[in-house]
Every structure is written in C-alpha cells, then in structure tokens.
Amino acid sequence: MTCCEGWTSCNGFSLLVLLLLGVVLNAIPLIVSLVEEDQFSQNPISCFEWWFPGIIGAGLMAIPATTMSLTARKRACCNNRTGMFLSSLFSVITVIGALYCMLISIQALLKGPLMCNSPSNSNANCEFSLKNISDIHPESFNLQWFFNDSCAPPTGFNKPTSNDTMASGWRASSFHFDSEENKHRLIHFSVFLGLLLVGILEVLFGLSQIVIGFLGCLCGVSKRRSQIV
C-alpha cells in the first residue's frame, strides 16, 4: 500500500472517531432536554443543538468520505484512481458539514445557554444566521456567560454583569454544580467547545483527504497483489 493509501485509511479512522464524537456531543443536550421535560419544566439548555451541528454537520455529512477512506484499507473497490477521486469528492462534503458544525458551535459559544439570554428559557434567541457570524469580533468572543460568576440577570431585563471581571467566577475553588443554572452553563460550554474542536479537526482531515485523493489520482495507487504475482 502506498503512503497515500495508508494516510487515507488513517484519515478514515480519524473521521470515524470524530463523526461518532460529534453525534454523541450533539446528543448530550438533546437527551438532557428530553429527560428534563416533565410537566412543569420544559427547560431546553439551548436551541443550537436542534440545528444538529454534530449529528448532521459533523456526522451524516462525514459518512461518505469516512466510508470511502476506510474501504481503502481493505484494498478493495476504492483502491484505485476512481476511488481516490471519489474520496476527495466526498471529503468536500465533509468539509462543508464540518464548517457548518463550526459555525453553529461558534454562535452557541457566543450566546451561551438559553437561560443566560432569556428569563423563561424561551427560544427567542435561537435564530442562526450567517449575518450573525459575520458580526463576530474577537473582543465579543469572551465567553462572559461562562467565566463570569453569573451568566445574566435572571429577569433578562438588565444588562449582564459586565463589571464582573473576566474569569472571576473561576479565580477561586468555589464553584458549584448544584443549580440548574450552573449545570446548563457547563453542559453548553463543554458540548459546543467539543463540537467546535470536532469541526476544526474534521476540516483538517477533510482537506488533507482532498489533497491525498488528488495525489492518488495523479500519481496512481498500488497494484493489487494478484496483479503483482
């Protein structure tokens, strides 16, 4: 097997791990929301998980490239110029899905969980748009909703506690996960930071697979053992 094929199968395995991780991470807040939905408390953590960045973006859209890359390991139908070309083509879909996952995750990390934006955990702050993405500035990406002691006033009428010095909630050992406020913040932060990292890694593996695919097409792949003998 040439270095191209070796790297392709390695890519396939990495994409499979990331794909599964994306689906699991996306599922966490969905499961928590479903578990929490008793008769009194329809309490979604955020609405960005309902855009399925991990399940669709990092998951479903990565399946074709992952499948193609993994079959290269078996030296089967994908172990040829056409297969390598298709794997790079499918990797474009992976990159698009991963970028979608990243964009949703960035917006989710910017806004924080619903309870930090809305007194009743309503879905009013849920709209996802590319315009919002273009409005992102480095100084706005400070995650104050997570690092401040409180993410926002419970009424949602007043300004967030902007005088709360950055990371003041974390500058000491005293932070507690007994309240739903804190559980929601931790879940939201962990899930979407994880999905952002999954998206970034999928983009990198996807791009490398595109390059490898074209190299495989140009340079050719190893002949089948039967043809050598």
């Epitope: 401040n148 003041s168 909630g169 050992s173 005293s174």
Partner: antibody
C-alpha cells in the same frame, strides 16, 4: 424583577413545629438554589442550608440538621422550611435568598419571617 | 467552619465621608466574599460579590477589594441611604459564614 415573598410572622409554643414559605417570582424557579438564613434579634447571621428546587436536592449546615427541613413545590414556585421541636433559641427572623452564579451567592432576599417561640 | 471577623462593629460618620469596613477570614478564601447591606427593620441587599464585583443596580460609590484572607468594603461620598448595617459573607466553603456586621450611624 426578582421577588421573594415570605409568609407572615408566627407565634408558636415550645416543642411545636412551624412551616414557613418563600414564593419566588420574576425568574425561573428551578434554575437557582434557594438558601435559608437565620438572624436572631441583635445577633449575627447563620446559614441554615439550601434546596435545589429542580431535583429537591438539599445541603444543610450540620448545626441545623434535624432542626430544619427544606422542601419546594415547582408548580407554585415556592420553597418551604419547616422547623421542629422549637425552643426559645429558635426565635429569630428567617430569610430565604436566591443562590446565583458559580458561587451560589445570595443574590436576592425575601423580606423575612419572624418566628417567636413563647409559652 | 471559616470564621469571619468584621471590624469595626460600629462607626459614626458624616454625610459625604469615605468609610472602609474590613473583614478577615480565618483562612484564605480566594476572593469568594460578598458584602450585604441591611437597613433598619428591612431585609438584605447584595452589594458586592467575588470581592470586587458590584451587583446590578448598586451605585459605583461602593467598591470592594482584598485578597487571601483580608477584604474590605469602601463607600465613598456617603449618602443618607447608606446608613445601615453591613455584613461580609464567605462563599468559599459550606457552611456559609457571615461577619458580625458593621453598623454605620450618622455622626
């Protein structure tokens, strides 16, 4: 606006029990813990404990275990504290306070419930 | 339990003065301290949390400082509505413990 409305004053006999309430409004009740604090006339403050209304989880000051019982009702957004086997030492004003942030700090306070234990 | 020692227990001051109230914890509390105000016959109001941060709606004449085990609350340009009892509270450990209080009186 966050409001914590506590029940009225209580005059009880030694050995009896009393149950006071704290009705929350202006925020999502299940998202924050509810603390209870004791203030004896002319004396300092003592933290009794807190309840997480979402799952009814509680944390008590060792000193008040067996004395105070914290409960809550999600449907009415009300927290309750029951004090048992009352003595004159339990005569005090009892406050509920919303616990917010990573530190579960006392962010908003009720107006207090005066409990007088007298024969 | 962490013991919070607050001083002074009372002080007489005039309108427009600047006052400082101090609180010493029996061990380091890593800025996990809050300051509360109680007006006569009334309930409590949170002023400062995590040593230096103002609660919403609290005037900027209130400020907090300190680190380790020693903290202070400073009120500049005292106004008539500031005459009350002030308490410190530690958020570092359970059980939560309070200072003994400082009563601000008009001179």
């Amino acid at each position: 606006e966050v409001q914590l409305q506590q029940s009225g004053p209580e005059l009880v006999k030694p050995g009896a029990s009393v149950k006071m309430s704290c009705k929350a409004s202006g925020y999502r009740f299940t998202n924050y813990v509810m603390h209870w604090v004791k203030q004896k006339p002319g004396q300092g403050l003592e933290w009794i404990g807190y309840i997480n209304p979402y799952n009814a989880g509680t944390k008590y000051n060792e000193k008040f275990k067996g004395k105070a019982t914290l409960t809550s009702d999600k449907s009415s957004s009300t927290a309750y504290m029951e004090l048992s086997s009352l003595t004159s030492e339990d005569s005090a004003v009892y406050y509920c306070a919303r616990g917010a942030g990573w530190s579960l700090r006392f962010a908003d306070w009720g107006q207090g419930t005066l409990v007088t234990v007298s024969a | 339990d962490i013991l919070m020692t607050q001083s002074p227990s009372s002080m007489s001051v005039s309108l427009g003065d600047t006052v400082s109230i101090t609180c010493h914890a029996s061990q380091g509390i890593s800025s996990n301290i809050g300051w509360l105000q109680q007006k006569p016959g009334k309930s409590f109001k949170g002023l400062i949390y995590l040593a230096t941060n103002l609660e919403d709606g609290v005037p900027s004449r209130f400020s907090g400082s300190g680190s380790g085990a020693d903290y202070s609350l400073t009120i500049t340009s005292l106004e008539s509505e500031d005459f009350a009892v002030y308490y410190c509270v530690q958020y570092s450990q359970f059980p939560r413990t309070f200072g003994g209080g400082t009563k601000l009186e008009i001179k």
